[in-house]
């Protein structure tokens, strides 16, 4: 459809509530550094514009494109260069060059506060302007990440106000909010990483391998659903998340929507754990299908070899409609395979394509494809043990541990990378122990592989903006699918040159003893970073007599009647016990 | 899901044409594979041709290469196989089946369709 307007089209379809939501999350994902009211302004004389194209379609400027409407309200923002540097250069460009370099600027670390919830300060805030509150929560959000998936944002922050509404009115406020806001958060930083990874896929490895993704996740869940449902299902959701990924957040959540109502009028055909989505209001019902649990196989599925091995037509397939053909195989494997992840799902279907492309130009393809299944089995076995090792490696040690564990690999693999992308790294690395070694034997390898992902992802977006280490930019650039195994591969770095010792780093204070547990461990998992960088070669044992000799200065330090003096003395005498240590 | 009815059939002289039809209801012909089958007395229901769902890639038994031809008309949801220079061994009835959302893959073993239409008997006979 064209519409005369675009802006106008939006508002009307997605409802002005919707629509400042998403106006202020656009924003804040561009100018993450901006104060709030700022952001509330800039939505305020964009949402009156709306409705005056709303009104009428042929006014001044309302036929321009959003990109355009949006572009040109950022950089009338007269602060720009002095906040915001070299994005301001952006504004020299003309549209699209413009919107792509604006994207470009997008900071994955920015330099914001972590957010403390204060539960009484926070109450009042809800109590006195609900709609500020709800504003607020989007643009902390979204500002912090800078490719949260807008729509989902909007639910998230029905969820937080709901929240507030409960707990607001108990007695105990913090004993009622603190762990609900826990749980939230946790669902937040999924969430943030796993549109953070579909929006790299599309970016750095083209729409077709977010659409084989797709394709292999939603015939997992949905496997009496045909080939052809799943495609067109595909297809949407690709316009969709290139949308959301490329900045145009209104056109996302419109189609969007247009995709939950299509699913739901089609899951007779698609899918019976639906009909509770279907019943639910717009956000929730989007989210409700996103999160939608797996349905029953059919019956009557016949054995993959028949249509993949034994059919004599495999070469016409697969040289007549390559794409389709191998579209049909990673369907086909994956309704079968809910219990592997999806990116081993696409490592099986990569095979599956190099051996018909070296068999079909020889003498005799069919038998030399016979045995195109048992060159899978190695791609299974991998990561099954691999987990299963790590996951008594994680019983064994404790999260915390088990958290130092992966510190000390990945930082013997790449010395190079920053401390505290190896930190925040490999802690997220450490939580795929609680997060899937408890779970049923079926579920561990999808659990951990695809989560595994999440994380390496998040290293990988991290070391382009500064890259320091050819292994790293290896890894994350030459195959999306194959960036675990990548990683997992690698071994201690033998050509890295030792970083001098420095004493600064071992120097703590008394505010060590007021952070809390997991900000305590983080201090202590920076220096054993900074130790392994000094001494790559140190010894489990050393390691292991540092960590608890660290542990006793600060229980001591901590203990003292003068915190700050005790760590005054003490710390000069634990950096010489640590070089002797490690002498 | 998918209903298949046939039609075309009769009695046709050595080396004469016949065109049989496939009208199918209940899902959209393109996006299925479809294929011909047909059973002679007393054998077994051989592959004739097919074609694939959304791709228009035809497939054909050895036996009937070069004189049969499908073919599917998208608007009117049928089917088609345009039989040339009959012989004598093409009498059988000639069955059409479907594969919904295979798009592509056209297999020749019977068991691996769900849908079938009730035949429409095919005599070559002087």
């Known amino acids: 459809d064209t519409y005369k307007s675009e802006i106008a089209h939006r508002f009307k379809d997605l409802g002005e509530q919707y629509f400042k939501g998403l106006v202020l999350i656009a924003f804040s994902q561009h100018l993450q550094q901006c104060p709030y009211e700022e952001h509330v302004k800039l939505v305020r004389e964009v949402t009156e514009f709306a409705k005056t194209c709303v009104a009428d379609e042929s006014a001044e400027n309302c036929d321009k494109s959003i990109h355009t409407l949006f572009g040109d309200k950022l950089c009338a923002i007269p602060s720009l260069r002095e906040h915001y540097g070299d994005l301001a250069d952006c504004c020299e460009k003309e549209e699209p060059e413009r919107n792509e370099c604006f994207l470009q600027h997008k900071n994955d670390n920015p330099d914001i506060p972590k957010l403390k919830p204060d539960p009484v300060a926070l109450c009042a805030d809800f109590q006195e302007d609900e709609q500020k509150f709800w504003g607020k929560y989007l643009y902390e959000i979204a500002r912090r990440h800078p490719y949260f998936y807008a729509p989902e944002l909007l639910y998230y922050a029905i969820i937080y106000k709901d929240v507030f509404s409960e707990c607001c009115q108990a007695a105990d406020k913090a004993a009622c909010l603190l762990p609900k806001i826990e749980h939230l958060r946790e669902k937040v930083l999924t969430s943030a990483a796993k549109q953070r990874l579909k929006c790299a896929s599309i970016q750095k490895f083209g729409e077709r391998a977010f659409k084989a993704w797709s394709l292999a996740r939603l015939s997992q869940r949905f496997p009496k659903a045909d080939f052809t449902e799943i495609s067109k299902i595909v297809t949407d959701l690709a316009k969709v998340h290139k949308e959301c990924c490329h900045g145009d957040l209104l056109e996302c959540a419109d189609d969007r929507a247009d995709l939950a109502k299509y699913i739901c009028e089609n899951q007779d055909t698609i899918s019976t754990k639906l009909k509770e989505c279907c019943d639910k209001p717009l956000l929730e019902k989007s989210h409700c299908i996103a999160e939608a649990k797996r349905d029953e196989l059919p019956a009557d599925l016949n054995p993959l070899e028949h249509d993949f091995v034994e059919d004599k037509e495999v070469c016409k397939n697969y040289k007549e409609a390559k794409h389709v053909f191998l579209g049909t195989f990673l369907y086909e494997y994956s309704r079968r395979h809910p219990d592997y992840s999806v990116s081993l799902l696409l490592r099986i279907a990569k095979i599956y394509e190099a051996t018909l492309e070296d068999c079909c130009a020889k003498e005799d393809p069919p038998a030399c494809y016979a045995t195109v299944f048992d060159k899978f089995q190695p791609l299974v076995d991998e990561p099954k043990n691999l987990i299963k090792q790590n996951c008594e490696l994680f019983e064994k040690l404790g999260e915390y541990g088990f958290q130092n564990a992966l510190i000390v690999r990945y930082t013997k693999k790449v010395p190079q990378v920053s401390t505290p992308t190896l930190v925040e790294v490999a802690r997220k690395l450490g939580l795929v122990g609680s997060r899937c070694c408890k779970r049923p034997e079926e579920e561990r390898l999808s659990c951990a592989e695809d989560y595994l992902s999440l994380v390496l992802n998040r290293l990988c977006v991290l070391h382009e903006k500064t890259p320091v280490s050819e292994k790293v930019t290896k890894c994350c650039t030459e195959s999306l699918v194959n960036r675990r195994p990548c990683f997992s591969a690698l071994t201690p770095d033998e050509t890295y040159k030792p970083k001098e010792f420095v004493e600064g780093t071992f120097t703590f204070h008394a505010d060590l003893c007021t952070l809390p547990e997991d900000e305590k461990q983080i201090k202590k998992q920076t220096a054993l970073v900074e130790l392994l960088k000094h001494k790559p070669h140190a010894t489990e044992e050393q390691l292991r007599t540092v960590l608890g000799n660290f542990a006793a200065f600060v229980q001591k330090c901590c203990a003292a009647p003068d915190h700050e003096a005790c760590f005054a003395v003490e710390g000069p005498k634990f950096v010489i016990e640590i070089r002797g240590i490690l002498a | 899901e998918v209903q298949l009815l046939e039609s075309g059939g009769g009695l046709v002289q050595p080396g004469g044409s016949l065109r049989l039809s496939c009208a199918a209801s209940?899902?959209?012909?393109?996006?299925?594979?479809v294929a011909w089958f047909r059973q002679a007395p007393g054998k077994e229901r051989e592959f004739v041709a097919g074609?694939?769902?959304?791709?228009?890639?035809?497939y054909y038994a050895d036996s009937v290469k070069g004189r049969f031809t499908i073919s599917r008309d998208n608007s009117k949801n049928t089917l088609y196989l345009q039989m040339n220079s009959l012989r004598p061994e093409d009498t059988a009835v000639y069955y059409c089946?479907?594969?919904?959302?295979?798009?592509?893959?056209?297999?020749?073993?019977?068991?691996?369709?769900?849908?079938w239409g009730q035949g429409t008997l095919v005599t070559v006979s002087s």
């Open positions: 209940g899902r959209y012909i393109d996006e299925t594979a």
């Open positions: 074609i694939g769902g959304g791709v228009d890639i035809t």
């Open positions: 089946a479907a594969r919904p959302g295979k798009p592509l893959i056209t297999s020749k073993v019977a068991d691996l369709y769900p849908y």
